[in-house]
Interface confidence: medium
């Protein structure tokens, strides 16, 4: 099986239908279509999925039937191109339909929109949701897949099936509970938060593959799997990396049926070979398929083997370093990364990749030098500052987080990042800075040994959100530079940015700082976002404002909202007190 399976099947669509089963087949085709055509109504997608499913069944019955030998891209692309409103709804994406495969699929991929113009998902009343769930469970769950997939066009499809299974379980349990809301809402909140995190993590994997190539993704995978499975042999880790790369390449490329099928195969292989991979897999491997795959992906690091020899022996002291490097560069560097990562679960993956890059650069130079050994003898000394930089950064920021709490820590980051890249849109700065700020509550609680992998790898995910959002409408050369030059140095690149002295402050617009009584009915989170939006705008108007000035204005603003939300005539209060606040803020900031 594996890479060569395709040759053995006359009909790819029949093969995948049989492998996956009808339910998963339909769900994955729906996800694929929704991720490509993000604006199409639900009913249109369901119709297309049903047509594809009926066709797949004819191919299962007779693999030689007409068109059954066509590739999945051809079949799915032809189906998408039958959508009548393609030109009106998607504009130039309709031009993709004039192309042949594989160019047509590449064209569809390029038109995936990370920030589609879709209304925010508003959660109906619990009773309304439970009624809809009971009336038509299948449609209800399909709608969930559709709404998530169209808003997250790179969501890891087999994992979305796992989320849908949990979503269904939550409704099955809670719609029978005495207090439906108390049972259901926390579960839905958890699924929403986990879903956003899962989407962002997968988006980084796809960006890594698409923008930096397979080699970059494989390097990431070697480091991560070596940390997770330190007892596994290098050959075993290499095999897992190859298979995992294939799975993610397929999912990121829109080949969702192949991806889900190959992910299932990989989970099966891992469980069949867990003795040579990790002692932590036992529980995962007893679970059903979707839970099993999810569990393996999240499994804790195995214990490091005792008495691992010093790395210096093979990678610095050996007289065969240059010989080994020359004979198979990527294998030798892969071994270095494997050996370093399995010894350092306390390092972030991106740090390990920076160390490997430093080692590679040193060998590239020294193995062509007069005296190679003398040249690379002190290479490990070059690692020290690379290790200390994130350690110090995390220490400082965790201290700041503990001192300020999450909301104010987010505000500090909002100010910091707005000053670095003030050209970026306010909603993007708010979203990204809020997520950056969550690193505090997510990671600072951990002991020293777990802080860096938690924090820096999480920051890589969040900064990738900034990069993909910025790529859609580029406005800052500094963001472009940090996003495109090096995947592993994105965080240090952004950290090193100082205040953008070239930025011309935004004209003051009183409308931006005009608030209404509707703010009083918002949830605490939404109210925070409103205040943080105002903070970003303030910094854009007055980039040289001091922390103290901004704090004073924000404190006044919080008091103003609190006061007016308690007033009898809220709207009048917001109008009158708002004018005073704007005037006072202008004076305080010298606008």
């Amino acid at each position: 099986r594996g890479v060569f399976r395709r040759d053995a099947h006359k009909s790819e669509v029949a093969h995948r239908f049989k492998d996956l089963g009808e339910e998963n087949f339909k769900a994955l085709v729906l996800i694929a279509f929704a991720q490509y055509l993000q604006q199409c109504p639900f009913e249109d997608h369901v119709k297309l999925v049903n047509e594809v499913t009926e066709f797949a069944k004819t191919c299962v019955a007779d693999e030689s039937a007409e068109n059954c030998d066509k590739s999945l891209h051809t079949l799915f692309g032809d189906k998408l191109c039958t959508v009548a409103t393609l030109r009106e709804t998607y504009g130039e994406m309709a031009d993709c339909c004039a192309k042949q495969e594989p160019e047509r699929n590449e064209c569809f991929l390029q038109h995936k929109d990370d920030n589609p113009n879709l209304p925010r998902l508003v959660r109906p009343e619990v009773d309304v949701m439970c009624t809809a769930f009971h009336d038509n469970e299948e449609t209800f769950l399909k709608k969930y897949l559709y709404e998530i997939a169209r808003r997250h066009p790179y969501f890891y499809a087999p994992e979305l099936l796992f989320f849908a299974k949990r979503y269904k379980a939550a409704f099955t349990e809670c719609c029978q509970a005495a207090d439906k809301a108390a049972c259901l809402l926390p579960k839905l909140d958890e699924l929403r938060d986990e879903g956003k995190a899962s989407s962002a993590k997968q988006r980084l994997k796809c960006a890594s593959l698409q923008k930096f190539g397979e080699r970059a993704f494989k390097a990431w995978a070697v480091a991560r799997l070596s940390q997770r499975f330190p007892k596994a042999e290098f050959a075993e880790v290499s095999k897992l990396v190859t298979d995992l790369t294939k799975v993610h390449t397929e999912c990121c490329h829109g080949d969702l049926l192949e991806c889900a099928d190959d992910r299932a195969d990989l989970a099966k292989y891992i469980c069949e070979n867990q003795d040579s991979i990790s002692s932590k897999l036992k529980e995962c491997c007893e679970k059903p398929l979707l839970e099993k795959s999810h569990c393996i992906a999240e499994v804790e690091n195995d214990e490091m083997p005792a008495d691992l020899p010093s790395l210096a022996a093979d990678f610095v002291e050996s007289k065969d370093v240059c010989k080994n490097y020359a004979e198979a560069k990527d294998v030798f560097l892969g071994m270095f990364l494997y050996e370093y990562a399995r010894r350092h679960p306390d390092y972030s993956v991106v740090l390990l990749l920076r160390l490997a890059k430093t080692y590679e650069t040193t060998l590239e130079k020294c193995c062509a030098a007069a005296d190679p050994h003398e040249c690379y003898a002190k290479v490990f000394d070059e690692f020290k500052p690379l290790v200390e930089e994130p350690q110090n950064l995390i220490k400082q920021n965790c201290e700041l987080f503990e001192q300020l709490g999450e909301y104010k820590f987010q505000n500090a980051l909002l100010v910091r990042y707005t000053k670095k890249v003030p050209q970026v849109s306010t909603p993007t700065l708010v979203e990204v800075s809020r997520n950056l700020g969550k690193v505090g509550s997510k990671c600072c609680k951990h002991p020293e040994a777990k802080r860096m992998p938690c924090a820096e790898d999480y920051l890589s995910v969040v900064l990738n959100q900034l990069c993909v959002l910025h790529e859609k409408t580029p406005v800052s050369d500094r963001v472009t530079k940090c996003c495109t030059e090096s995947l592993v140095n994105r965080r240090p690149c952004f950290s090193a940015l100082e205040v953008d002295e070239t930025y011309v402050p935004k004209e003051f617009n009183a409308e931006t700082f005009t608030f209404h009584a509707d703010i009083c009915t918002l949830s605490e989170k939404e109210r925070q976002i409103k205040k943080q939006t105002a903070l970003v705008e303030l910094v854009k108007h007055k980039p040289k404002a001091t922390k103290e000035q901004l704090k004073a204005v924000m404190d006044d603003f919080a008091a103003f909202v609190e006061k007016c939300c308690k007033a009898d005539d809220k709207e009048t209060c917001f109008a009158e007190e708002g004018k005073k606040l704007v005037a006072a803020s202008q004076a305080a900031l010298g606008l």
Epitope: K319, C322, K323, Y325, A326, E364, K365, C367, A368, A369, A370, D371, P372, H373, E374
Partner: antibody, heavy 119, light 111 residues
Framework: EVQLVQSGAEVKKPGESLKISCKGS????????IAWVRQMPGKGLEWMGI????????RYSPSFEGQVTISADKSISTAYLQWSSLKASDTAMYYC????????????WGQGTLVTVSS | QSALTQPASVSGSPGQSITISCSGI?????????VSWYQQYPGKAPKLIIY???KRPSGVSNRFSGSKSGNTASLTISGLQADDEAEYSC???????????FGGGTQLTVL
């Protein structure tokens, strides 16, 4: 096609300064060492020193340390050999060579620059 | 930093084999196989003919071969031809921090 092109012959007086050049093309200039080699009239070859243009790391043979300066400008893929005060004994043919491979070997050479120092 | 020692000249008739020795290879250079041989015609730039003791760059005739025993490296040219007449220099490393050293060169004459 890998090429190293050196600047033309020079005739100088003792005490004068001089900078000769070696421009690389057809390969990644920043990722290979460049060596300078001296050959005095009727004599053998002598390694003078090497430079890695990627980071300007420079090493000199003991007998040339302090006598010459090796530098590089990676933006124009050019390495240099310079003297601040020439002596008659500096009269020689000077070659640049790209050092390449697992251990350095001069696999491509410039055509040579003849430097004559005479009063 | 002493130069490597080579014979000043060797000669041979067409079709014969000759060997040029190069003594004084440091143990470091020996362990890393850091020995190269260059051919140079009068008025021309040197040309690499052997590197890492025994390896030939592409385009170099297999009549040229290299070997090493102890602290001495050797270049053997079999089936001598008239156009092999040239100066041959070995090169290696003198030790830590040294750039490299050449031997004094050997003039090969084809009789």
């Amino acid at each position: 096609e890998v090429q190293l092109v050196q600047s033309g012959a020079e005739v100088k007086k003792p005490g004068e300064s001089l900078k000769i050049s070696c421009k690389g093309s057809g390969y990644s200039f920043t990722r290979s060492w460049i060596a300078w080699v001296r050959q005095m009239p009727g004599k053998g070859l002598e390694w003078m020193g090497i430079i890695y243009p990627g980071d300007s790391d420079t090493r000199y043979s003991p007998s040339f340390e302090g006598q010459v300066t090796i530098s590089a400008d990676k933006s124009i893929s050019t390495a240099y050999l310079q003297w601040s005060s020439l002596k008659a004994s500096d009269t020689a043919m000077y070659y640049c060579a790209r050092l390449h491979g697992v251990v350095s070997r001069g696999d491509y050479w410039g055509q040579g620059t003849l430097v004559t120092v005479s009063s | 930093q002493s130069a490597l020692t080579q014979p000043a000249s060797v000669s041979g008739s067409p079709g014969q084999s000759i060997t040029i020795s190069c003594s004084g290879i440091s143990s470091l250079a020996g362990s890393y196989n850091l020995v190269s041989w260059y051919q140079q015609y009068p008025g021309k730039a040197p040309k690499l003919i052997i590197y890492e003791v025994t390896k030939r760059p592409s385009g170099v005739s297999n009549r040229f071969s290299g070997s090493k025993s102890g602290n001495t490296a050797s270049l053997t040219i079999s089936g001598l031809q008239a156009d092999d007449e040239a100066e041959y220099s070995c090169s290696s490393y003198a030790g830590r921090n040294a750039v490299a050293v050449f031997g004094g060169g050997t003039q090969l004459t084809v009789l």
